[in-house]
Interface confidence: medium
């Protein structure tokens, strides 16, 4: 179990000529809202296929009225995250669809009018529990900037949120603050609790008590923009006073990056991340067009012929950055399972597996299910050095020898009645509720022809699940 979270940072006209001035039609003011749809796997699916991993709508954004002669701004956005809960394992590979919708307010008579302004579809690999991934995408004449992550909830842990850690009444052999993990009784996992005050937006941690910063942020709590600080890079718990891993003057002191570039330390040197339109060791080269060949590593340059117009580099797989100058660390997503060693060969990823494991991602345990039998039609599932039985309906226990009641956990919400069924459990919902677990109200209160937020939301609520 867990939650996929999407944060929209900005939505506005893209660079270059022909960009729209306003999202609204000539009929008057409008407001924006976003829809996120998650589908499993990396295959191209029809737009009409269901969002099998889940979907969510944002609240409506503030009303936008175009100001004549004013520069086209980033548009006012809805507050809060879009959150899509997932009940089962996080698949790791998924298709992310973000739609930007316009709700027209010019005609107050009758029902609302919605138009799809932009749709972004990205096929992604993402491990649960990792830091925020950032992205910038063009959709027609619009540009969307967003971040996303998947995180486990309740007692689930691991990159797929499939391993359950449950506290035991027996005293743990693990150290303080650690909890025993099932089904591996001897393995202990610490839920990483970041350093107090660590920025939720710009920081993350992999070990308890640390605060590591996303690119462009620094300081002990990742609250200082990198370009204004003399202490940059990933921050560990080494120094309680400064948060700096390297004491004393560093290569980024005084910020050697020109034109708003942000500096990050590298071993014995520094690296500048340049804003669009600038490049060079210190972001000192400006007035760049595609004719100057600013896109490295085979990146495709798109831009106007006018010297003042911006350019955009479309990077090939494995590279990123405004000029495709950075190699993507594909091993940072920890694709190799069961302790396998990740090797990025450039053209491909390779996993070197520990003894007893095999497969492209070391996902197969060679001896888990050998000679093991699961009773009553159960199936043996490999994983983690100890076999596990996936039991048929009505049975449970380590080897599926115990009778189990699928309704025992009271899975039906809002007073729904649970019935055991040959293919699963069935919820008979109380009046006013629907869904496979009676989780959705049939008719949310307080809706009107032009709601200030999607039905069932009050202003300030972050999102509505679909």
């Amino acid at each position: 179990a867990g939650v996929f979270e999407l944060q929209i940072h900005s939505f506005g006209p893209g660079p270059g000529p022909g960009a729209p001035r306003s999202p609204c039609s000539a009929r008057g003011p409008c407001r924006l809202f976003f829809r996120v749809c998650l589908k499993p796997g990396l295959s191209e699916e029809a737009a009409e296929s269901p969002c099998a991993l889940g979907a969510a709508l944002s609240a409506r954004g503030p009303v936008y009225t175009e100001q004549p002669e004013a520069p086209a701004p980033d548009l006012p956005l809805p507050n809060g995250l879009l959150q899509v809960p997932f009940r089962d394992a996080w698949p790791g590979t998924f298709s992310l669809i973000i739609e930007t919708w316009r709700e027209e307010l010019g005609d107050q008579i009758g029902g609302p009018a919605w138009s799809l302004l932009a749709r972004v579809t990205r096929r992604r690999r993402l491990a649960a529990g990792g830091p925020w991934a950032r992205d910038i995408q063009r959709a027609g004449a619009w540009e969307l900037r967003f971040s996303y992550r998947a995180r486990c909830e309740l007692l689930a842990v691991g990159t797929a949120c499939t391993r359950l850690c449950r506290p035991r009444s027996a005293p743990s052999r693990c150290g303080p603050g650690l909890r025993p993990c099932a089904p591996l009784e001897d393995e202990c996992e610490a839920p990483p609790v970041c350093r107090a005050g660590c920025s939720l937006e710009h920081g993350f941690c992999e070990q308890p008590g640390e605060c590591r910063c996303l690119e462009g942020w620094t300081g002990p709590l990742c609250t200082v923009p990198a370009s204004t600080s003399s202490c940059l890079g990933l921050r560990g718990p080494s120094s309680a006073t400064t948060g700096c891993l390297v004491p004393g003057p560093g290569p980024c002191d005084g910020n050697p990056c020109a034109n708003g570039g942000s500096c990050s330390e590298t071993p014995g040197s520094f690296e500048c991340t340049c804003p669009r339109g600038f490049y060079g060791l210190r972001c000192e080269v400006s007035g760049v067009t595609c004719a100057d060949g600013p896109c490295f590593n085979g990146g495709l340059c798109v831009g106007g012929a006018d010297p003042d117009s911006a350019y955009i580099c479309h990077c090939p797989p494995g590279f990123q950055g405004s000029n495709c100058e950075k190699r993507v660390d594909r091993c940072s997503l920890q694709p190799c399972r069961n302790g396998g060693l990740c090797l990025d060969l450039g053209h491909a990823l390779r996993c070197r597996c520990r003894a007893g494991f095999a497969g492209p991602r070391c996902e197969h345990n060679l001896d888990d299910c050998a000679g093991r039998a699961c009773a009553n039609g159960g199936t043996c599932v490999e994983g983690g050095g100890a076999h596990r039985c996936s039991c048929a309906l009505g049975f449970g226990g380590r080897d599926c020898r115990e009778r189990a009641d699928p309704c025992a956990a009271r899975p039906c919400a809002h007073g729904g009645r649970c019935y055991a069924h040959f293919s699963g459990l069935v919820c008979a919902c109380a009046p006013g509720y629907m869904g496979s677990r009676c989780e959705f109200p049939v008719h949310p209160d307080g809706v009107s022809a032009l709601p200030a937020a999607p039905p069932g939301l009050r202003p300030g609520d972050p999102q509505r699940y679909l």
Epitope: R35, P50, I109, G110, A113, H443
Partner: nanobody, 127 residues
Framework: QVHLVESGGGSVQAGGSLRLSCAAS?????MGWFRQAPQKEREWVAT???????????YYVDSVKGRFAISQDNAKNTVYLQMNSLKPEDTAVYVC????????????????????WGQGTQVTVSS
């Protein structure tokens, strides 16, 4: 192809209630109700999102807000219009409509948005 079947119409005194049902034979994105009174133009009444885009989002024409409630049963592919505090001016043939095509524009009050229509059911409110 989506087939729509309405039921639940009838005669009622002013202030009374009726519940209309519309069952769809296939997947839809929106389902709604229009009405047409004698010598009047067809009027949009209410619509609810039934597909995964705006699932459960309900919208109404101003004149019925607070009196009518549209709801759905996804398992049965059925939409209901609960009509309370009925007035003589609510007398009309009520027709169920559905949107099956994926679109980048949904203007719910426009009949042209809807691809499929039912036969209609008569609602008569006497004073």
């Amino acid at each position: 192809q989506v087939h729509l079947v309405e039921s639940g119409g009838g005669s009622v005194q002013a202030g009374g209630s009726l519940r209309l049902s519309c069952a769809a034979s296939g997947y839809t994105y929106f389902m709604g109700w229009f009405r047409q009174a004698p010598q009047k133009e067809r009027e949009w009444v209410a619509t609810i999102g039934t597909g995964d885009i705006f699932n459960g989002a309900a919208y109404y024409v101003d004149s019925v807000k607070g009196r009518f409630a549209i709801s759905q049963d996804n398992a049965k592919n059925t939409v209901y219009l609960q009509m309370n505090s009925l007035k003589p001016e609510d007398t009309a043939v009520y027709v169920c409509a559905a949107v099956q095509s994926k679109s980048s524009n949904y203007v719910l009050r426009d009949a042209s948005t809807y691809n499929y229509w039912g036969q209609g059911t008569q609602v008569t409110v006497s004073s």
